[in-house]
């Protein structure tokens, strides 16, 4: 559910044209001849966290030493890249880039908010869609699963395209595409439920283009702590957008008196944002801010990258853990508002939904909780990790593991509390989601630590694919299916409607515990994998002949 595909996409890959690549090779030779192993040539050999004042680059992948900054244009300074590039290269002007970077990051983050707002507006009006189209629970699960499946398949494709073509054009086209499809889907006649399913699939493709490419642009616009900050803002757009999706869905349908209008809000905002991206986002080169970006050309084949990633145990286990998070967030996001509505029917504080609008209050509250817990989760997760790093090198995966295991307890308690107290259930949701969401930013850092920059785009795409495949691609459908299965062997009653869905959702805490175990497994290999990645980065700074990746 919650954009784990973009949680680690911070770095770019190859340059845009072969000519640029050729110029770069010539430049590297010249720089080495001049004795330059500064920012334009290679990074220093210092490990993470070992630096003199002013010579440390803080990226999501840790701290790497670089040569002290001198006057622009001299070897060993950030400015020398422009000088060395020669007249043929088109380097963005630092001044204009500096002015526009903040606006660009803000627009990209806004676009991410809209991606998720659009996705979860459907969840916010799910009951109404079910009522209008005559959709059964299995059909409602299918809607979300089709979206995630298409997203999952499209993400690696856009990751590939994003490394080779104009990224902001792909981004804008993606936004315009999903906006048009979502807007059109609000007019689908009752008899064409399959058209609604198809439209969600197409929206998934459109949104995949954004989620895979936007973080790499942010990664190229900023460096040091600023990059971490900007990516955190970008990630916070996920819970914010998801929460706003629920809120928009339920409040717009209430105001307009028809659920169709809820699907017309995000497309209008999407068109505006797409246009702003074309205007305000600068056409940065890949690896612009991270000075190694120019040197760290992808030198290995895609197949070799994949083999290396599969052998990277920290990466594999953290990817499996993100799949568990994805499974739980996808299922809970889809079914919890309906579950709470049924709980109130059992408690006789609400009536069975006979005609739309249905369960608006639950979607609204759940949306607000998702918003706030997303923010709280990112902040507490990052804070806890920063504190724990003083105690142990394995802080990142351990904080994630504790968060997951703690979350599982509170997710279990939701189903206990819901039987007697909706307020109690909401409190459990609040704590459970906060703990679950606390690992977002940290998971990004883990990937950056253990994967070398030239493989990060591939790593992000593969992690995106697996987290969706094993996670939220099937979980909403699976929960609906299990709920139906239980209900078929019980008598018809509001109590069993509530219980069957609750029993089905009980699968989530078990998967979350499994995810916690995967994070603990990550902790076992994290230090050695991180050291290996740093060693390889240092090797990449040497002449190509000596590079063994």
């Amino acid at each position: 559910m919650m954009c784990l595909e973009c949680a680690s996409a911070a770095a770019g890959g190859a340059e845009e044209e072969e000519a640029d690549a050729e110029r770069r090779r010539r430049r590297r030779g010249a720089q080495r001849g001049a004795g330059g192993s500064g920012c334009c040539g290679a990074r220093g050999a210092g490990g993470a966290g070992v630096s003199a004042a002013g010579d440390e680059v803080q990226t999501l992948s840790g701290s790497v030493r670089r040569a002290p900054t001198g006057p622009p244009g001299t070897p060993g300074t950030p400015g020398c890249a422009a000088t060395a590039k020669g007249p043929g290269a088109q380097q963005p002007k630092p001044a204009s880039l500096g002015r526009g970077r903040g606006a660009a990051a803000a627009i990209l983050s806004l676009g991410n908010v809209l991606n998720y707002l659009d996705r979860y507006t459907v969840a916010g009006v799910l009951l109404d869609i079910q009522q209008h189209f005559g959709v059964k629970d299995r059909g409602a699960g299918l809607l979300q699963s089709v979206f995630i499946c298409s997203f999952m398949v499209a993400a690696p494709i856009f990751g590939y395209l994003g490394d080779r073509f104009n990224r902001k054009v792909i981004l804008s086209c993606g936004i315009f595409f999903w906006s048009a499809v979502t807007f059109s889907s609000s007019f689908i006649p009752q008899q064409y439920f399959w058209l609604l399913v198809l439209s969600r699939g197409l929206v998934g493709i459109g949104e995949a283009s954004y989620s895979t490419i936007a973080p790499t642009i942010i990664g190229d616009l900023f460096t040091k702590n600023t990059r971490t900050l900007m990516l955190s803002v970008f990630y916070f757009a996920i819970p914010l957008g998801s929460g706003l999706g629920y809120i928009t869905g339920s409040s717009v349908k209430q105001a307009a008196g028809a659920w169709h209008w809820a699907l017309r809000v995000s497309p209008v905002l999407g068109m505006i944002t797409g246009t702003l991206i074309l205007i305000l986002v600068p056409a940065t080169k890949r690896g612009h801010a991270d000075q190694l970006g120019d040197q760290l050309k992808a030198r290995t084949s895609w197949l070799r990258d994949m083999k290396a990633l599969i052998r990277n145990r920290s990466y594999v286990f953290s990817s499996l853990a993100t799949s568990a998070v994805s499974f739980a967030t996808g299922a809970l996001g889809m079914w919890i508002p309906l579950y709470l509505h049924r709980a109130q029917v059992v408690q006789k504080t609400a009536e069975t939904c006979n005609s739309p609008p249905c369960g608006a209050k639950d979607s609204l509250i759940f949306g607000a909780i998702t918003c706030f817990t997303g923010f709280l989760g990112v902040v507490t997760g990052a804070g806890a990790t920063r504190w724990c790093r003083l105690k142990t090198q394995r802080a990142d995966p351990l904080v994630c593991a504790v968060g997951m295991l703690g979350s599982a307890i509170f997710i279990c308690l939701i189903f206990v509390a819901a039987k007697s107290s909706i307020v109690g259930a909401y409190i459990c949701i609040f704590v459970g989601e906060t703990l679950l969401f606390s690992n977002w930013a940290i998971t990004a850092d883990i990937l950056m630590y253990v994967v070398i920059p030239t493989r990060r785009a591939t790593a992000v795409a593969l992690q995106s694919f697996t987290s969706h495949l094993l996670g939220d691609a099937g979980s909403p459908y699976l929960i609906g299916f299990i709920s139906d299965l239980i209900r078929q062997s019980t008598k018809d009653s509001p109590l069993w409607e509530f219980l069957s869905l609750g029993y089905a959702l009980m699968l989530c805490p078990f998967v979350v515990v499994l995810g916690g175990m995967f994070f603990l497994a990550t902790a076992l290999f994290f230090v050695s994998d991180r050291a290996r990645a740093e060693q390889q980065v240092n090797q990449l700074a040497m002449p190509p002949a000596s590079v063994k990746v």
Partner: antibody
Framework: EVQLVETGGGLVRPGSSLKLSCATS????????MSWVRQAPGKGLEWVAL??????????NYAESIKGRFTISRDDSKSRVYLQMNTLRDQDTATYYC????????????????WGQGVMVTVSS | DIVLTQSPPTLSVTPGESVSLSCRAS??????IHWYQQRSNESPRLLIK???QSIAGIPSRFSGSGSGTDFILSINRVESEDFSVYYC?????????FGPGTKLEVK
């Protein structure tokens, strides 16, 4: 062949109760939405109640005119749908039809693709 | 509730003629309209679903059209067995409602 057979009609006094039954065959009943539609003598058709399948929480919907007095239910093991009518009024006098909604596995149509032969309910003092 | 109005209430035609029966909704309902035929002393049967989609076993002379608020049921060259009452029904929103019917009679 799809078959819907209604039973349980008759003459009753205002304020009394009656339970209509509809036996079905020829299709997968447990996956199908069912409705009752009535027709007063010489008048048009009026939808009364709808019951969805278990995959839709066996949710029931009612017309405003009968809400609180009539209850629709189903027994998947017997492939039967029922209409429990309480506090009957003169204006409830009608032929009651058991109807089936067309099913598409993931969703269902709200229209009626098959109708029973109908059962007469007369409410009179 | 969505109110359906059918016109004319009664239509007198001679066999072989082609006729159009109208159904108007009180608000836009896209194509969520369905047509039923009820012969004397018989149960209704589905003729057309979703304004224009034909039903298996229904003669091809029956066709439907329209979208939004105005809908038409057309019978091309009326046959003797077509003389009956025709109802439209909306499924756009609950409660499900029927039109008052149009009676097609022999001229």
């Amino acid at each position: 062949e799809v078959q819907l057979v209604e039973t349980g009609g008759g003459l009753v006094r205002p304020g009394s109760s009656l339970k209509l039954s509809c036996a079905t065959s020829g299709f997968t009943f447990s996956d199908t939405w069912m409705s009752w539609v009535r027709q007063a003598p010489g008048k048009g058709l009026e939808w009364v109640a709808l019951i969805k399948d278990k995959n839709s929480n066996s949710e029931a919907n009612y017309a405003e005119s009968i809400k609180g007095r009539f209850t629709i239910s189903r027994d998947d093991s017997k492939s039967r749908v029922y209409l429990q009518m309480n506090t009957l009024r003169d204006q409830d006098t009608a032929t009651y039809y058991c109807t089936r909604h067309e099913d598409f596995y993931y969703y269902s149509g709200y229209y009626f693709d098959y109708w029973g032969q109908g059962v007469m309910v007369t409410v009179s003092s | 509730d969505i109110v359906l109005t059918q016109s004319p209430p009664t239509l007198s035609v001679t066999p072989g003629e082609s006729v159009s029966l109208s159904c108007r909704a009180s608000q836009g309902i896209s194509t969520s309209i369905h047509w039923y035929q009820q012969r004397s002393n018989e149960s209704p049967r589905l003729l057309i679903k979703y304004a224009s989609q034909s039903i298996a076993g229904i003669p091809s002379r029956f066709s439907g059209s329209g979208s939004g608020t105005d809908f038409i049921l057309s019978i091309n060259r009326v046959e003797s067995e077509d003389f009956s009452v025709y109802y439209c029904q909306q499924t756009y929103s609950l409660p499900l409602t029927f039109g008052p019917g149009t009676k097609l009679e022999v001229k």
